[in-house]
């Protein structure tokens, strides 16, 4: 058993049928010695008397808010949460496996640049009685500071019969140098509590591996005289690290017909312009990627050919 | 410790082309190592990230773009002095800082070259003959060093009398390649910045 925060405790249980559970001793936070009784949650049934209460915690029915009273007055509370260990592995009931980029990916994180700012998000089908708290650091043995905000509900989607909820959090490394070569990964830890169930999820990454630039901006077409060709031009996104000659991007330009089946023409360039043939009803899209370290491509920025 | 924005002579930068080749070569070699050594811990998540140049060179700091010198987190107090004469410095206007930067890059390359050659000698003794260093990568390191053209003491190749532990050697190869790829990215960024300056 360990303390999650003041008066909230997590009991770790080896979770299998007929498991013996864990013996927990609760102590009433009071100078009083006599006439103390204990109850659980809203029930008025007295579980025991005395300054300490010994309970065998086996299942969720044994968890909850234990309260000690004296003469009708509440003295203190202890909230017990359960953390299930199923065959050597901590349970992951609260969050959905996003399966990208690999199985057992519960937290996904992205950074728009090398400033040390990043966003993480996760999915759940649970809509109520749910709280998250997020901590982060650079490295784990001698951790350096990363500050995270509060997790917020950022999207709701309908998936088949289920509603899916997306939560996200923004974090900022306290003293980040965009040009630094990372040798210690960023660690992100999310505590999740649903009703009386506690779970924790972690992710470990280098900023360089989670870079995903914003799409190129100011995408424009300039028709070339007496030709079906157009000059496409664009600019680096505002959110990208500067100077651009040091933090260079490479670009992919795509001409896509109206039908998804039509052949796509693709050009790769390090410049911020390209000459392509603009077909009728087609659209031109451009996306960006770090020129030197192949992390994710940005989303597409698009303009119609007409 | 920074690079001022200079106005170099046209075509000053043969090093840009070499640094791009270097990044391509080390990335290919790392990909090959990860595929060949699939039963070894060779992914970025599994290896310890070690930098053999740590406390010996200070490439990131010495080559910091002018725009980032205002960022206190980028200004490390490590001081290292280097020899300063190189053929990439085609313009006399180029500052001492730029020379220091390129000299630091040269030292990095020299250290990695020695490590890779020592390692290759061990890998050639492996009865499994599982993996060797790509000669193209070694050649590209050499070409960039020649383009930088700094005079510096030659570092003797390390020779080891004890029987090599091939498992450990292959894991060390992965660690070295990951670190060298990261340094090659920095070198490429620096060369691109200098080329644009």
């Amino acid at each position: 058993i360990w303390e999650l925060k003041k008066d909230v405790y997590v009991v770790e249980l080896d979770w299998y049928p007929d498991a013996p559970g864990e013996m927990v001793v609760l102590t009433c936070d009071t100078p009083e010695e006599d006439g103390i009784t204990w109850t659980l949650d809203q029930s008025s049934e007295v579980l025991g008397s005395g300054k300490t209460l010994t309970i065998q915690v086996k299942e969720f029915g044994d968890a909850g808010q234990y309260t000690c009273h004296k003469g009708g007055e509440v003295l203190s509370h202890s909230l017990l949460l359960l953390h299930k260990k199923e065959d050597g592995i901590w349970s992951t009931d609260i969050l959905k496996d996003q399966k990208e980029p690999k199985n057992k990916t519960f937290l996904r994180c992205e950074a728009k640049n090398y400033s040390g700012r990043f966003t993480c998000w996760w999915l759940t089908t649970i809509s109520t009685d749910l709280t998250f708290s997020v901590k982060s650091s650079r490295g784990s043995s001698d951790p350096q500071g990363v500050t995270c905000g509060a997790a917020t509900l950022s999207a709701e989607r309908v998936r088949g019969d289920n509603k899916e909820y997306e939560y996200s959090v923004e974090c900022q490394e306290d003293s980040a140098c965009p040009a630094a070569e990372e040798s210690l990964p960023i660690e992100v830890m999310v505590d999740a509590v649903h009703k009386l169930k506690y779970e924790n999820y972690t992710s470990s990454f280098f900023i360089r591996d989670i870079i995903k630039p914003d799409p190129p901006k100011n995408l424009q077409l300039k028709p070339l005289k007496n030709s079906r060709q157009v000059e496409v031009s664009w600019e680096y996104p505002d959110t990208w690290s500067t100077p651009h000659s040091y933090f260079s991007l490479t670009f992919c330009v795509q001409v896509q017909g109206k039908s998804k089946r039509e052949k796509k023409d693709r050009v790769f360039t390090d410049k911020t312009s390209a000459t392509v043939i603009c077909r009728k009803n087609a659209s031109i899209s451009v996306r960006a990627q770090d020129r030197y370290y192949s992390s994710s491509w940005s989303e597409w920025a698009s303009v119609p050919c007409s | 410790r920074n690079l001022p924005v200079a106005t170099p002579d046209p075509g000053m930068f043969p090093c840009l082309h070499h640094s791009q080749n270097l990044l391509r070569a080390v990335s290919n070699m790392l990909q090959k190592a990860r595929q060949t050594l699939e039963f070894y811990p060779c992914t970025s998540e599994e290896i310890d990230h070690e930098d053999i140049t740590k406390d010996k060179t200070s490439t990131v700091e010495a080559c910091l773009p002018l725009e980032l010198t205002k960022n206190e987190s980028c200004l490390n107090s490590r001081e290292t002095s280097f020899i300063t004469n190189g053929s990439c410095l085609a313009s006399r206007k180029t500052s001492f800082m730029m020379a220091l930067c390129l000299s630091s890059i040269y030292e990095d390359l020299k250290m990695y070259q020695v490590e890779f050659k020592t390692m290759n000698a061990k890998l050639l003794m492996d009865p499994k003959r599982q993996i060797f260093l790509d000669q193209n990568m070694l050649a590209v390191i050499d070409e960039l060093m020649q383009a930088l053209n700094f005079n510096s003491e030659t570092v003797p190749q390390k020779s080891s009398l004890e029987e090599p532990d091939f498992y450990k050697t292959k894991i060390k190869l992965c660690i070295l390649l990951h670190a060298f790829r990261i340094r090659a990215v920095t070198i490429d960024r620096v060369m691109s910045y200098l080329n644009a300056s």
Partner: antibody
Framework: QVQLVQSGGGVVQPGRSLRLSCAAS????????MHWVRQAPGKGLEWVAF????????YYADSVKGRFTISRDNSKNTLYLQMKSLRAEDTAVYYC????????WGQGTMVTVSS | SYVLTQPPSVSGTPGQRVTISCSGG????????VKWYQQLPGTAPKLLIY???QRPSGVPDRFSGSKSGTSASLAITGVQAEDEADYYC????????????FGTGTKVTVLG
């Protein structure tokens, strides 16, 4: 004490269907994940499928994906395995078992797929 | 397709020490715990060892488990006639959990 009693096995022709049941008692069935495991005559153990405590997630071996469906009725304390498009290679003793560091197994039920 | 490899058979005389190996990889035994089961003819498997080296209550202390790197082993010190059975190791693969990975199985024969 924990008990898992299986039923529903038998002889079936290739291409036909069969549903196995596993009735649980002696524990809070709705709190635990459950597996199906099979064993072909004279062969080793092969995992077939798993279902979470609340039925929200199901996992299958590649050999049965798309043909077998694991399900549970927590109000009846029962686990099911619906088997469709049965093949000769599905012939085996099928076991249900609880998920956890300590597990409990059903007695097994024989499924024979033969024409 | 079995990813955990066991010897098909091992044998020993009563009182002898018998060991069964179970060889896997970094993504299964290398990163997860191992269980061992005993299966007597015509019966369901019975848990002998969980968490690499833990014995459930009721399992004789002549059975012991260990794990090193990507391999595990089960030892029976002072093998007895009633130990003649099939033995299976089991682990998980970190990419396909909670799918159970079973070993190929080992037949233990007690001679004499």
């Amino acid at each position: 004490q924990v008990q898992l009693v299986q039923s529903g096995g038998g002889v079936v022709q290739p291409g036909r269907s069969l549903r196995l049941s596993c009735a649980a008692s002696g524990f809070t069935f709705s709190s635990y994940g459950m597996h199906w495991v099979r064993q072909a005559p004279g062969k080793g153990l092969e995992w077939v499928a798993f279902i979470r405590y609340d039925g929200s997630n199901k996992y299958y071996a590649d050999s049965v994906k798309g043909r077998f469906t694991i399900s549970r009725d927590n109000s009846k304390n029962t686990l099911y395995l619906q088997m469709k498009s049965l093949r000769a290679e599905d012939t085996a003793v099928y076991y249900c078992k609880t998920h956890g560091s300590h597990d409990n197994w059903g007695q097994g039920t024989m499924v024979t797929v033969s024409s | 397709s079995y990813v955990l490899t066991q010897p098909p058979s091992v044998s020993g005389t009563p009182g002898q020490r018998v060991t069964i190996s179970c060889s896997g990889g970094r993504s299964n035994i290398g990163s997860d715990t191992v269980k061992w089961y005993q299966q007597l003819p015509g019966t369901a498997p019975k848990l002998l060892i969980y968490g690499n080296d833990q014995r459930p209550s009721g399992v004789p202390d002549r059975f012991s488990g260990s794990k090193s790197g990507t391999s595990a082993s089960l030892a029976i010190t002072g093998v007895q006639a009633e130990d003649e059975a099939d033995y299976y190791c089991q682990s998980y693969d970190r990419g396909t959990h909670p799918a159970l990975l079973f070993g190929t199985g080992t037949k233990v024969t007690v001679l004499g």
